[in-house]
């Protein structure tokens, strides 16, 4: 009774297409698969960034897999062939592992890379990234930003840098077509006459860094003697109403402060017969149904009403 064996995949490698962290893991079928012609072999692939505790595991019948990685660190991957039990009249047979690693040889010391990288997608329309130069770098150092997301055929360089004293400290991006809900990859590298500069890699999804405009058209109506309805409109722009969450700050007679979060553009407030004046401000953020994270907008302009005036209007109506 001969033991069934299978070889590992051949030519296993990690290929960097220049997409700033989106890599291809690819391989060839193992040698001597002739005995298993009627059988579709599978491959178990494990990969991770070096330093990560956990492996991502994929089982596929294809000869490649694509995923995003953090190029600030190295990447390690391993793969073996699986012969399903249907092919062996018994239990699953696994080959030994084939292994591959990939890393970008770092230039310069870590301190030379950009500091405090910050990216905001204003009103889901305009992406702006800013950074500070590395520690101890001279004024001859300049940084360049490159970006890629699925849909672009190559990484693009920023064409509209924000400069201070001739040094690039940020980038205003052009219109980014079909760029949300997918990984957005950025590399900021640098050049200097005096010393090599370390590159930095960043990955995020645009819908998670949106800072909306503040709500507009704040109004206030008295629904009944002790009920006041606050209303506002969604900010102008491409963000649909269903994607907003709001925070309201209400001040009664310069004393009581109420902060509350609501999911639509109205809020009904109970007041006492002592209330003379009512002021409120609202700010907006993209909610959990449209993103995993977000940035609060600035507060709207403060609007104040005399309760007596509101009551008169209500009685007139």
């Amino acid at each position: 009774d001969t033991e069934i064996k299978v070889n590992p995949p051949q030519d296993f490698e990690i290929v960097d297409p220049g997409y700033l962290g989106y890599l291809y893991l690819q391989w060839q079928p193992p040698l001597s698969l002739d005995n298993f012609k009627e059988c579709t072999v599978e491959y178990e692939l494990k990969y991770r960034n070096i330093g990560s505790e956990t492996w991502t595991t994929i089982i596929t019948k294809n000869l490649h897999y694509k995923d995003g990685f953090d190029l600030n660190k190295g990447i390690e991957a391993k793969i073996h062939t699986l012969l399903p039990w249907q092919c062996t009249n018994g239990s699953e047979v696994q080959s030994s592992w084939a292994e591959a690693t990939y890393w970008i040889s770092p230039q310069g010391i870590p301190e030379t890379k950009v500091q405090d990288m910050d990216c905001v997608y204003y009103n889901w329309q305009y992406l702006l990234c800013s950074w500070k130069p590395g520690i101890g770098v001279l004024l001859d150092t300049n940084y360049n930003l490159f970006y890629w997301y699925e849909g672009l055929d190559r990484a693009l360089q920023c064409v509209d840098y924000i400069k201070v004293d001739g040094q690039n400290i940020g980038c205003r991006f052009p219109y980014l077509e079909s760029s949300d809900y997918k990984d957005f990859y950025i590399c900021v590298n640098g050049s200097s006459e005096t010393k090599p500069i370390r590159s930095s890699y960043f990955t995020f999804q645009l819908q998670n860094i949106v800072k909306p405009l503040p709500p507009v058209c704040l109004t206030c109506t008295q629904e009944s003697l002790y009920e006041i309805k606050l209303k506002w409109s969604i900010p102008l722009g491409p963000i649909p109403a269903r994607c907003f969450v709001y925070e309201i700050e209400i001040r009664e007679d310069d004393t009581t402060l109420v902060t509350t979060t609501v999911e639509n553009e109205t809020y009904t407030l109970k007041i006492t017969n002592e209330t003379r004046q009512l002021c409120f401000v609202v700010r907006s953020k993209v909610n959990i149904y449209c993103s995993d994270d977000g940035i609060w907008s600035e507060w709207s302009d403060k609007q104040c009403w005399e309760v007596e005036e509101l009551l008169k209007k209500t009685l007139l109506l």
């Epitope: 290929v15 297409p17 220049g18 997409y19 291809y24 690819q26 060839q28 079928p29 579709t40 019948k61 294809n62 000869l63 490649h64 694509k66 055929d153």
Partner: nanobody, 121 residues
Framework: QVQLQESGGGLVQPGGSLRLSCEVS????????MAWYRQVPGKEREMVAQ???????KYYGSAKGRFTISKDSAKNAVYLQMNSLKPEDTAVYRC???????????????WGQGTQVTVSS
């Protein structure tokens, strides 16, 4: 089902050039990567160059700077332009494609028979 036909091999003097061609025919719905390998008898095959996903081009070993891989998607063909040839480039050059059959769902690897390249004075 899928045939790979190589041509362009032969005897060439050191410093000379050759252009290898590989035409793919048969029932293949998509070609995802195309490569040239070479093998010397008694040694393991080695990858020379490939055009992989996203038209990424990669060269291996001594092929860098001397060889150029290209493809013609309309003809389902891949080429290898070899310049500044050296005696150590002598080998059987085999074309490989990874693609999906019209009747299939998963990638398969297909090989040509190979074409002999001999570099000698």
């Amino acid at each position: 089902q899928v045939q790979l036909q190589e041509s362009g091999g032969g005897l060439v003097q050191p410093g000379g050039s050759l252009r290898l061609s590989c035409e793919v025919s048969g029932s293949i719905s998509s070609i995802n990567r195309m490569a040239w390998y070479r093998q010397v008898p008694g040694k393991e095959r080695e990858m020379v160059a490939q055009i992989t996903y996203g038209d990424t081009i990669k060269y291996y070993g001594s092929a860098k700077g001397r060889f150029t891989i290209s493809k013609d998607s309309a003809k389902n063909a891949v080429y290898l332009q070899m310049n500044s040839l050296k005696p150590e480039d002598t080998a059987v050059y085999r074309c490989n494609i990874v693609g999906v059959l019209t009747t299939g769902h998963y990638e398969n690897s297909f090989w040509g028979q190979g074409t002999q390249v001999t570099v000698s004075s």
